[in-house]
């Protein structure tokens, strides 16, 4: 009797178990009683990534430098194009739709990623013995300059934005 | 349901050609399928002519070199046989088949 | 071409008994993607044939039970569990795996 199921790589269509169109390729025909699935190939435009019954491919993405986007890997039949942020700009969402441009790491933060075409800055605050005091999408926190290793004694305290202030010791009287 | 119906003459002159036409209903020839014309001389058994696919593409028989076109009018939902340069021993019945379906045949008979 | 051989080409059997055709292929019947397109075909007299078994051992819809197909490469068996009245008939083998398609020369089945 007709199948109810079909096995991997087959669907099931008017009581036949058909053979899915491999990836790269379209579906122009289901198989019947007498004859094969057929497909065919995508367009140089065009992309399916899985087995499947698609009547029509998928167009590549298109990285549209107006959104700030470059291509980084070129689509093939089973692939689509990939996209990137040019230098100073990195995704809004994981599909790279378009860009913005990195955020800097406001004073008393400091760099703990840089940011990539894909990712964005990563910030952190700068821990007790660090600062920063420059607005930077590059620079880390730095540590307090130690006042003691130059024979001089802290005259003031360091904060998270600012350094400490080095001074010459008290001479007795 | 899909029927299939044959239709064209029943006797030809030898030398001339043979044209029958095969109207469809129930299911459209440019949706999927091949369709086949097959015949069968009296008393033998059956032959394969040759088919037009849901595309409008062929393919023949080889015994019958060049003699045989099958075409189609989409607009019809019809695909028709043209035999040429018959002999008596295209004598047949002539069936138009998706295989699954077949027309009731229809004999023809090349005779002067 | 694929030249399709059947036995035997007559066939007498008693009512409520089994019966067994054999389809043999001069080259395989099984394509690239691992599917063979060889079918059985009941032709009753005075009719038109009639598809019983499709890829080799799928029943069409509305065909008795008591019909089965098997084989694989170039052997292939029509089987009738138990032959009834309304068996008699010609059946033939037919293979579209491979272009042209080619019939059996057909076996004859009568009642004892």
């Known amino acids: 009797e007709p199948p109810t199921a079909c096995r991997e790589k087959q669907y099931l269509i008017n009581s036949q178990c058909c053979s899915l169109c491999q990836p790269g390729q379209k579906l122009v025909s289901d198989c019947t009683e007498f004859t094969e699935t057929e497909c065919l190939p995508c367009s140089e435009s065009e992309f399916l990534d899985t087995w499947n019954r698609e009547t029509r491919c998928h167009q590549h993405k298109y990285c549209d430098p107006n959104l700030g986007l470059q291509v980084q890997q070129k689509g093939t039949s089973e692939t689509d194009t990939i996209c990137t942020c040019e230098e100073g700009l990195h995704c809004t969402s994981e599909s790279c739709e378009s860009c913005v441009p990195h955020r800097s790491c406001l004073p008393g933060f400091g760099v703990k990623q840089i940011a990539t075409g894909v990712s964005d800055t990563i910030c952190e605050p700068c821990p007790v013995g660090f600062f920063s005091n420059v607005s930077s999408a590059f620079e880390k926190c730095r540590p307090w300059t130690s006042c003691e290793t130059k024979d001089l004694v802290v005259q003031q305290a360091g904060t998270n934005k600012t350094d400490v202030v080095c001074g010459p010791q008290d001479r007795q009287r | 349901q899909v029927q299939l119906q044959e239709s064209g003459p029943g006797l030809v002159k030898p030398s001339e050609t043979l044209s029958l036409t095969c109207t469809v209903s129930?299911?459209?020839?440019?949706?999927?399928?091949?369709w086949n014309w097959i015949r069968q001389p009296p008393g033998k058994g059956l032959e394969w002519m040759g088919y037009i696919r849901y595309d409008g593409s062929n393919n023949y028989n080889p015994s019958l070199k060049n003699r045989i076109t099958i075409s189609r009018d989409t607009s019809k939902n019809q695909f028709s046989l043209k035999l040429s340069s018959v002999t008596a021993a295209d004598t047949a019945v002539y069936y138009c088949?998706?295989?699954?379906?077949w027309g009731q045949g229809t004999l023809v008979t090349v005779s002067s | 071409d694929a030249v399709m051989t059947q036995s035997p080409l007559s066939l007498p059997v008693t009512l409520g008994e089994p019966a067994s055709i054999s389809c043999r292929s001069s080259q395989s019947l099984e394509n690239t993607n691992g599917n063979t397109f060889l079918n059985w075909f009941q032709q009753k007299p005075g009719q038109s044939p009639r598809l019983l078994i499709y890829?080799?051992?799928n029943r069409f819809s509305g065909v008795p039970d008591r019909f089965s197909g098997s084989g694989s490469g170039t052997d292939f068996t029509l089987k009738i569990s138990r032959v009834e009245a309304e068996d008699v008939g010609v059946y033939y083998c037919?293979?579209?795996?491979?272009?042209?398609?080619?019939f059996g020369q057909g076996t004859k089945l009568e009642i004892k």
């Open positions: 088949a998706r295989l699954d379906y």
């Open positions: 129930g299911y459209s020839i440019t949706s999927n399928y091949y």
């Open positions: 037919l293979q579209v795996t491979h272009v042209p398609f080619t």
């Open positions: 890829r080799v051992s």
